[in-house]
């Protein structure tokens, strides 16, 4: 057979659909790969093939169109299953041919089991969501596809293991489910259940997602510097191990790049040749506001290193700020036997 | 548990058009910072019920008003005091009404399960 | 803004039937609509929430349906207590940019002959 673009195994795709469910899968192909979709192909004389690799096997094989109840079609550039059974798990490959043209990729399909509160193995997208901002909401998610516009589905909303219908300041609108206020109480795993009949035959499609509450934008600050502050002066001998602490708060953004470095007279401690380490520890509170601490050591300082400055940085999408450490060189004790002598013979 | 109503006076709240009011909701038996929302529903004389608008009771002032309200209205809370406070501003005669206070459990948007007895509001020169 | 309508208004039954108030929607409210009890001189009393479920002490007798933008109230049994105006209230959280929008219907009178 001639030469055809493989595209391997596309592992970042790794698709999880629940047992006894429809499911319908594009072909990635379109998506991530090639520069034309399917309706180009088609009219351009190119065919789209499928097959499979079982789970735990190494040959490749046709899918069986022929199934009863057509369980398993193709539709223009989507495998369908109606519905998904355990051993439908395995590596699919579609691939785009005709004679002198062929480009392939494989892509690992996985059917799980969820028990009766929806809990499985399911990799779950998180939406968060702002913290006492106001009516905010979330949709079910990839349900598009699956059945027509004329046809009205029926939606059930769950928390964990409960339907919602009149708690925790959430109200269930059809594919949308909307906060009334978030709060932390609303953390946790939110399943929308929707059913609809098709030929005969009712679906039901389950959407499971974790919802996180977040920090609210309208509260949101600069990043603040708690240390190094006024308050602390970090004294030292030379040969001493000079230990400097800077820790900063982030408000919780969005997309928010938070960072914080050091500077030794003005220059990123790797630009200068004192023996400087620089380790970082990162806290979260339960609203996701951050707090980094990066810790400078010196291990033996010298008088040089103590009469440097020492800027501990920080900056957020909110703004920059800077914060010097108070160092300096401890005046070494005064030495009262001598002195005691010297004024006693004075006298 | 109830909720009990006060402002304008014992018999209610004569106002001249223009005019302010506030008027409040004390919770007995339970708490405000049990998360509840406080709301509030208007009754003209002889009509029928009218939503004004709720607020959160607990630690944050999220509030959400009826679209015709049109900003003359504010609502308040004190967890301290267990009350919740309408404050009525630029009345009109068309303002003229039985004014209660409801409490939305679990923050459904329309489960009042529980009421107060009322306060009528005439707004006449 | 939503708009709740009520049919029909009065309605008359008498002890021991059946009564049936309609209340329609002006959007898709799905199941958040409750219905209200109200005697004179008193505040409103619950008695259904999400569209079907009775309020706790509220007599079986009283049963709601309905979800979307059509609703139904079902009194059976009809008792002379149960002479009142019953409102509903529906809620939604899309049309506004306020973004929540309560709606009562305009009542239905309830006489028991």
């Known amino acids: 057979s001639e030469r055809c673009d493989d595209w391997g195994l596309d592992t970042m795709r790794q698709i999880q659909v629940f047992e006894d469910e429809p499911a319908r899968i594009k072909c990635p192909l379109f998506e991530h790969f090639l520069k034309f979709n399917y309706s180009t192909a088609h009219s351009a004389g190119l065919t789209l093939i499928w097959y499979w690799t079982r789970q735990d096997r190494d040959l490749e094989e046709p899918i069986n169109f022929r199934l009863p109840e057509n369980r398993i079609s193709k539709e223009k550039d989507v495998l369908w299953f109606r519905p998904t059974l355990l051993n439908d798990t395995g590596n699919y490959t579609c691939m785009l041919r005709n004679t002198t043209y062929c480009s392939k990729v494989a892509f690992p399909l996985e059917v799980v089991q969820k028990d009766s509160c929806f809990n499985s193995p399911m990799k779950l997208p998180v939406h968060k969501l702002y913290i006492e901002y106001g009516i905010q909401r979330i949709t079910c998610p990839n349900v598009d596809g699956y059945f027509p516009s004329s046809v009205k589905p029926t939606i059930t909303w769950y928390m964990g293991c409960y339907k919602i219908q009149n708690f925790n300041n959430v109200i269930p609108e059809g594919m949308n489910l909307s906060f009334l206020i978030a709060l932390i109480s609303n953390n946790g795993n939110y399943t929308c259940v929707v059913t609809y009949p098709e030929n005969g035959r009712t679906f039901h499609l389950t959407r499971t997602l974790t919802v996180k509450v977040v920090g609210s934008p309208k509260n949101a600050v600069p990043p603040v510097i708690h240390s190094p502050n006024d308050h602390v002066v970090y004294e030292k001998e030379p040969g001493e191990e000079l230990l400097i602490p800077c820790t900063v708060y982030f408000s919780f953004l969005m997309d928010s790049r938070n960072e914080v470095w050091w500077t030794i007279d003005g220059k990123k401690p790797d630009d200068i040749t004192i023996d400087v380490t620089i380790n970082e520890s990162i806290s979260h509170s339960r609203t996701e506001d951050e707090t980094r601490t990066q810790i400078l050591s010196i291990k033996k300082v010298t008088s040089e290193d103590l009469k440097r400055s020492y800027v501990c940085h920080a900056r957020s999408a909110k703004g920059e700020v800077a914060k010097a450490a108070k160092v300096k060189q401890k005046v070494p004790a005064p030495r009262y036997t001598v002195e005691l002598a010297c004024g006693f013979g004075a006298t | 548990q109830q909720l009990e109503q006060s402002g304008g006076g014992a018999e209610g709240g004569l106002v001249k058009p223009g005019g302010s009011l506030e008027l409040c909701c004390k919770a007995s038996g339970f708490s405000l910072s049990s998360a509840y929302w406080i709301c509030w529903v208007r009754q003209a004389p002889g009509k029928g019920l009218e939503w004004v608008g709720c607020i959160y009771a607990d630690s944050s002032s999220i509030t959400y008003y009826a679209s015709w309200v049109n900003g003359r209205f504010t609502l308040s809370r004190d967890i301290d005091q267990s009350t919740g406070c309408l404050q009525l501003n630029s009345l009109t005669a068309a303002d003229t009404a039985m004014y209660y206070c409801a409490r939305d459990y679990g923050g459904s948007g329309y489960n009042f399960n529980l009421w107060g007895q009322g306060t009528l509001v005439t707004v006449s020169s | 803004a939503l708009v709740m309508t009520q049919t029909p208004s009065p309605v008359s039954a008498a002890v021991g039937g059946t009564v049936t108030i309609s209340c329609q929607a002006s959007e898709d409210i799905y199941s958040n609509l409750a219905w209200y009890q109200q005697k004179r001189g008193q505040p409103p009393k619950l008695l259904i929430y999400y569209a079907s479920t009775l309020a706790s002490g509220v007599p079986s007798r009283f049963s709601g349906s309905g979800s979307g933008t059509e609703f139904t109230l079902t009194i059976s049994g009809l008792q002379s207590d149960d002479a009142a105006t019953y409102y509903c209230?529906?809620?939604?959280?899309?049309?506004?940019?306020?973004?929540?929008?309560?709606?009562f219907g305009g009542g239905t009178e309830v006489v028991v002959k």
């Open positions: 209230l529906g809620v939604c959280t899309y049309i506004n940019a306020n973004g929540w929008d309560n709606a």
